[in-house]
Amino acid sequence: MMTGTIETTGNISAKKGGSVILQCHLSSTMAQVTQVNWEQHDHSLLAIRNAELGWHIYPAFKDRVAPGPGLGLTLQSLTMNDTGEYFCTYHTYPDGTYRGRIFLEVLESSVAEHSARFQIP
């Protein structure tokens, strides 16, 4: 039985050219996290964090995606095209798969609202 829940940063905004941390957290379960996948709005892979093998960053993003903190992902040099949904998929044992969603809005304005708890200034 899957008792856990995924907590995410929810809807966040960040400045064009800036950085943002995408963060999910699995709670209310003792299940072991074996792998976390990060995907973009079109379901294309951004990164994988395997508990035993470490990180795999999709090659085209390697210059602007930084692993961490923790199981999260730091997106750098943001462009307007980065606006959209992001998904974290947690593979766990013995529970199975959990999925979380984050919506990122990249703002042109230099006075972008800092609504993300995990955002880098």
Epitope: L45, N50, D63, T97
Partner: antibody, heavy 119, light 107 residues
Framework: EVQLVQSGAEVKKPGASVKVSCKAS????????MHWVRQAPGQRLEWMGR????????KYNEKFKSRVTITVDKLSSTAYMELSSLRSEDTAVYYC????????????WGQGTTVTVSS | DIQMTQSPSSLSASVGDRVTITCRVS??????LAWYQQKPGKSPKLLVY???TLAEGVPSRFSGSGSGTDFTLTISSLQPEDFATYYC?????????FGPGTKVDIK
């Protein structure tokens, strides 16, 4: 065109070390992780470890952890695998293989380097 | 370690035959399975990753299926250049492990 060109065959004595090189071309070396896999005569493939050429961070198969070191030279786009304390069971073909776009599998392989351990 | 078994270990087939190779895994690996083809004296060649995604340049007669612990590689119509040994590999944990191989030869 992606190419992984490995160093030539080696003959080593038991207890010695061997260092195999793998020169990459046709892609951005630091954007793709590199794996090392070996195959003893008539045996299945055996994964040894992987490295991130960008950071130099590596992960090893526990079986080889105390004897294998994987390194890179970013300037020459070359990966290296050094195996120490060689024994006859280490006689095998050693492959470097580039990690794929979508995970920990390998999409391009070097031609292989035969390492023979014999007294 | 995750254990990989393949069946059959070898098979004889004719050009045009439909060939199916099975890979069984000791624990749930979701869809993190790759298939490789290897010819004598040559390096392995990637055919399929993520259980069912065909690698670039691989003919459409090859297909992969399965998830969890049971996986299949199918060659819909065997061609002369397909006679080789086929290996499955999980790409989910450390160590990455390969199956023992299935040798496909000419009947």
């Amino acid at each position: 065109e992606v190419q992984l060109v490995q160093s030539g065959a080696e003959v080593k004595k038991p207890g010695a070390s061997v260092k195999v090189s793998c020169k990459a071309s046709g892609y951005t070396f630091t954007n793709y992780y590199m794996h090392w896999v070996r195959q003893a005569p008539g045996q299945r493939l055996e994964w040894m470890g992987r490295i991130d050429p960008d950071s130099g961070g590596s992960k090893y198969n526990e079986k080889f952890k105390s004897r294998v070191t994987i390194t890179v030279d970013k300037l020459s786009s070359t990966a290296y695998m050094e195996l120490s304390s060689l024994r006859s069971e280490d006689t095998a073909v050693y492959y470097c293989a580039r990690e794929g776009h979508y995970g920990f599998y390998s999409d391009y392989w070097g031609q292989g380097t035969t390492v023979t351990v014999s007294s | 370690d995750i254990q990989m078994t393949q069946s059959p270990s070898s098979l004889s087939a004719s050009v045009g035959d439909r060939v199916t190779i099975t890979c069984r895994v000791s624990e749930n690996i979701y869809s993190y399975l790759a298939w490789y083809q290897q010819k004598p004296g040559k390096s392995p060649k990637l055919l399929v990753y993520n259980a069912k995604t065909l690698a670039e340049g691989v003919p459409s007669r090859f297909s992969g299926s399965g998830s969890g612990t049971d996986f299949t590689l199918t060659i819909s119509s065997l061609q002369p250049e397909d006679f080789a040994t086929y290996y499955c590999q999980h790409h989910y944990g450390n160590p990455l492990t390969f199956g023992p191989g299935t040798k496909v030869d000419i009947k």
